[in-house]
Interface confidence: low
């Protein structure tokens, strides 16, 4: 029998600045019945408080409600185990709510073929921000991905999107059936999950020549161009 | 309360369109992750999925019957309509019209109509 | 399209009794898996959504479990007025369908 092993908090995230919840991995608990209890401090301040809720976010976890939860400032909190034996804590975290927001995934996906008389044929994609997240207050940019693949595939195209709403896609198979996802993130923080998937069938009439396959902004009312390689590594993941 | 509600004709002739209101009372149209979805089902069968349209206007359709169905919403008159070309008997069934819940991770139906029966029958 | 395989198609139990259904997705739908429970001559009725959550206001005896292709909704002690039919739904992927429900009958 020995004292508990070190806690340490692995996780933070919060999905709209507004609430935030933080989870912890024990350590090894020394062959006895283990209490684990959080504190933290917000910086610029030495009185420490306990963990409102660690019921919300689920085992091993604090969740701050919006009551607790500020912007702008950094919480320093720790994990203290403690059993007949002895205590241990985890290292020190430093958390900035503004750098831990992962949203939920983007609503309302929708995918159309769209087949004008005098232009091209494209596929259009929509969806909605999600629900938690208020964007008029300007505190969020969120930036959108799109992926996409036919049915069989086993490889995604992905297609970023910037801060639209919207996006169109030119260069597909015609005749196949292609899987549409979207997800989102903020300027800083994390990727959300990705939407539930649209299915859509490709037209087998959908088609077009060489030149077509180059779009240009104002072909497409500057509401997309194709990504680099470049770009497209740059914006992927957080 | 939610609740929703079915209207359009009992009887069609086969190879006309009908065409199905749904009336919702206590949520909006326009609310962000709310949508309305059309179900049907035969006498004695299965519920068969026909459509749906979400607040940002976003719309899918049954593959089997998509060259047939239009759905649309009068968010002002809290109504979302189905209209299906070249009605057949197998068509025959109650019409149902069902709420979509966004939650965070879910999609569900959380509030339908009583549903309407529509036979289609010369 | 996502075919939904539900068994059984229609099963005998009594009151009392712990009753198991069983729902099968063609492909993976994560936890996109709805169930509903209808009475003759009435709309279906939201029992569980998201796999396991349990609706509002629907009795506990109710439970879900299951993700990936692989559904369960088992009642643990049916009740009388559980003797109906019940149906999965998925929605991760539009278009979206229902299983093709279970019956369950008095023995």
């Known amino acids: 029998q020995l004292p508990p092993g070190k806690p340490e908090i692995f996780k933070c995230r919060s999905p709209n600045k507004e609430t935030f919840t933080c989870w912890w991995r024990p350590g090894t608990d020394g062959g006895l019945p283990t209490n684990y209890s959080l504190t933290y401090h917000r910086e610029g301040e030495t009185l420490m408080h306990e963990c409102p809720d660690y019921i919300t976010g689920g085992p091993n976890s604090c969740h701050f409600g919006k009551q607790y939860t500020s912007m702008w400032r950094t919480y320093i909190m720790m994990v203290n185990a403690t059993n007949q034996m002895g205590s241990s804590f985890s290292d020190e975290l430093y958390v900035d709510v503004t750098y831990i927001v992962q949203p939920d995934p983007p609503l309302e996906l929708a995918v159309e073929v769209k087949q004008p008389e005098d232009r091209k044929p494209y596929l259009w994609i929509k969806w909605s921000p999600p629900t938690l997240i208020d964007l008029k207050t300007g505190w969020f940019t969120l930036l959108y991905e799109i992926r996409l693949k036919p049915e069989k595939a086993a490889e995604w195209e992905i297609h970023f999107a910037g801060q639209q709403t919207e996006f169109k896609i030119l260069s597909l198979h015609p005749g196949q059936k292609y899987l549409v996802q979207v997800r989102c993130k903020p300027d800083h923080g994390y990727w959300s999950a990705w939407s539930p998937a649209t299915f859509i069938q490709i037209p087998s009439d959908f088609t077009m020549n060489d030149e077509q396959k180059l779009i240009s902004e104002e072909d497409l009312g500057g509401e997309q161009k194709l990504i680099s390689e470049e770009d497209l590594h740059h914006h992927h993941h957080h | 309360q939610v609740t929703l509600k079915e209207s359009g004709p009992v009887l069609v002739k086969p190879t006309q369109t009908l065409s199905l209101t749904c009336t919702v009372s206590?949520?909006?149209?326009?609310?962000?992750?709310?949508?309305v979805s059309w179900i049907r089902q035969p006498p004695g069968k299965a519920l068969e999925w026909l459509a749906h349209?979400?607040?940002?206007?976003?719309?899918s359709y049954s593959t089997s019957l998509k060259s047939r169905l239009t759905i649309s919403k009068d968010t002002s008159k809290r109504q979302v309509v189905l209209t299906m070309t070249n009605m057949d008997p197998v068509d025959t069934a109650t019409y149902y019209c069902?709420?979509?819940?966004?939650?965070?991770?879910?999609?569900?139906?959380?509030?339908w109509g009583q549903g309407t029966l529509v036979t289609v029958s010369s | 399209d996502i075919q939904m395989t539900q068994s059984p198609s229609s099963l005998s139990a009594s009151v009392g009794d712990r009753v198991t259904i069983t729902c099968r997705a063609s492909?993976?739908?994560?936890?996109?898996l709805n169930w509903y429970q209808q009475k003759p001559g009435k709309a279906p009725k939201l029992l569980l959504y998201?796999?396991?959550s349990l609706q509002s206001g629907v009795p506990s005896r109710f439970s879900g479990s299951g993700s990936g292709t692989d559904f369960t909704l088992t009642i643990s002690s049916l009740q009388p007025e559980d003797f109906a039919s019940y149906y999965c739904?998925?929605?991760?992927?539009?278009?979206?369908?229902f299983g093709q429900g279970t019956k369950v009958e008095i023995k």
């Open positions: 069902a709420r979509i819940r966004t939650g965070t991770y879910s999609l569900y139906l959380d509030y």
């Open positions: 206590g949520f909006s149209l326009s609310d962000a992750g709310m949508g």
């Open positions: 349209i979400f607040s940002n206007d976003g719309k």
């Open positions: 492909q993976s739908i994560n936890s996109y």
């Open positions: 998201f796999a396991s």
């Open positions: 739904q998925e929605s991760y992927s539009t278009p979206w369908t």
